[in-house]
């Protein structure tokens, strides 16, 4: 029976400048029941405080609620293990919210063949940003990531489309079926998750761009 | 509605002691950081004390340090004061206050008035 | 301890007119300071924090400036109202000292 080892906060994620949740890995328990408690205070404060939610995150995580995050403010955070031999802390961890945003996905993923009779045809992609962002107040730019492959095939191929909610391919298989997805990342942070995939059927006589 | 409701104030002896109350409501309690702040008749306002949401962390002022306790049950969402020794100077309405999540008194109590007098 | 240094201690002042009331920490706080409002025989309210942030629902004529070691709460419209003691208060680290009040009055 020893006191337990050095737990670790290996990630801190911020969906939206809003909220976060920070996340730790337990050390080793020292054969003993161990509790866990996250303490934090802000830069240029010396004001203790605890974390105030453990249960939002999932196990051996702290969640902060909108009343809880400044984004203009360092977090400087660590975790304390103790059992009945004794405690060990976390290395501290210095959080700015700024920089660990990873949204959820974009939204409502649309994909459409367009064959104009004039021009070469082209699959239309269009999606919205994620609902939890709101980008009139001009704290986000969000960029985009599109990737789609055929049903069957391995690679993906992947377009940047800046800060565009909208993007028109030329090169595709005709008569393929592909599966097409897109993420965003702030300007500072984190890819988002794909999106679920979408299913579209290139047609047949879809001509390929020169 | 977000309420906090102090009790337990009252007239007592210099050395004597008191448990002050203080209910909360509308809010998830066990969340949140709680404070005792005071007033003396005609004067300002004094902090007394903090506790951090689990009571870990818990910080006094040098003037009540060693005589008066602040613990909290999070399960009766309540918070309380337990004050020993009091003197003619701990005479005041004393306030609970919540602690906000950027460290502001946001919600405060209707108060309890504490008479310290033989 | 850091101390909160209120001036002035009160003040009387016309309907319309422009307040402005100082707080002085005896060492830097950053911009961790707040401003409340107390009207004779009611609770304290929170009226800034952060030094500069109103908080909801207090009227736009409120407003705060200030980092560091000075700090100021100005009323750019005295209303009838507003009479009342105000207080800065510092919430960098304990213990969170209250200044000594400013009270206002109205001429």
């Known amino acids: 029976q020893l006191p337990p080892g050095k737990p670790e906060i290996f990630k801190c994620r911020s969906p939206n400048k809003e909220t976060f949740t920070c996340w730790w890995r337990p050390g080793t328990d020292g054969g003993l029941p161990t509790n866990y408690s996250l303490t934090y205070h802000r830069e240029g404060e010396t004001l203790m405080h605890e974390c105030p939610d453990y249960i939002t995150g999932g196990p051996n995580s702290c969640h902060f609620g909108k009343q809880y995050t400044s984004m203009w403010r360092t977090y400087i955070m660590m975790v304390n293990a103790t059992n009945q031999m004794g405690s060990s802390f976390s290395d501290e961890l210095y959080v700015d919210v700024t920089y660990i945003v990873q949204p959820d996905p974009p939204l409502e993923l649309a994909v459409e063949v367009k064959q104009p009779e004039d021009r070469k045809p082209y699959l239309w992609i269009k999606w919205s940003p994620p609902t939890l962002i709101d980008l009139k107040t001009g704290w986000f730019t969000l960029l985009y990531e599109i990737r789609l492959k055929p049903e069957k095939a391995a690679e993906w191929e992947i377009h940047f489309a800046g800060q565009q909610t909208e993007f028109k391919i030329l090169s595709l298989h005709p008569g393929q079926k592909y599966l097409v997805q897109v993420r965003c990342k702030p300007d500072h942070g984190y890819w988002s998750a794909w999106s679920p995939a979408t299913f579209i059927q290139i047609p047949s006589d879809f001509t390929m761009n020169d | 509605e977000v309420q906090l409701v102090e009790s337990g104030g009252g007239l007592v002896q210099p050395g004597g002691s008191l448990r002050l109350s203080c209910a909360a409501s509308?809010?998830?309690?066990?969340?949140?950081?709680m404070n005792w702040v005071r007033q003396a008749p005609g004067k300002g306002l004094e902090w007394i004390s903090y506790i951090s949401s689990r009571g870990g962390t818990i910080y006094y002022a040098d003037s009540i340090k060693g005589r008066f306790t602040i613990y909290r049950d999070n399960a009766r969402n309540s918070l309380y004061l337990q004050m020993n020794s009091l003197r003619a100077e701990d005479t005041a309405i004393y306030y609970c206050?919540?602690?906000?999540?950027?460290?502001?008194?946001?919600?405060w109590g209707q108060g309890t008035m504490v008479t310290v007098s033989s | 301890d850091i101390q909160m240094t209120q001036s002035p201690s009160s003040l009387s002042a016309s309907v319309g007119d422009r307040v402005t009331i100082t707080c002085r920490a005896s060492?830097?706080?950053?911009?961790?300071l707040a401003w409340y409002q107390q009207k004779p025989g009611k609770v304290p309210k929170l009226l800034i924090y952060?030094?500069?942030t109103l908080q909801s629902g207090v009227p736009s004529r409120f407003s705060g400036g200030g980092s560091g070691t000075d700090f100021t709460l100005t009323i750019s419209s005295l209303q009838p109202e507003d009479v009342a003691t105000y207080y800065c208060?510092?919430?960098?680290?304990?213990?969170?000292?209250f200044g000594g009040g400013t009270k206002v009055e109205i001429k």
């Open positions: 509308g809010f998830t309690f066990s969340s949140y950081e």
């Open positions: 060492q830097g706080i950053s911009n961790y």
């Open positions: 206050a919540r602690l906000s999540g950027v460290d502001i008194f946001d919600i």
């Open positions: 208060q510092r919430y960098n680290s304990a213990p969170l000292t």
């Open positions: 952060f030094a500069s």
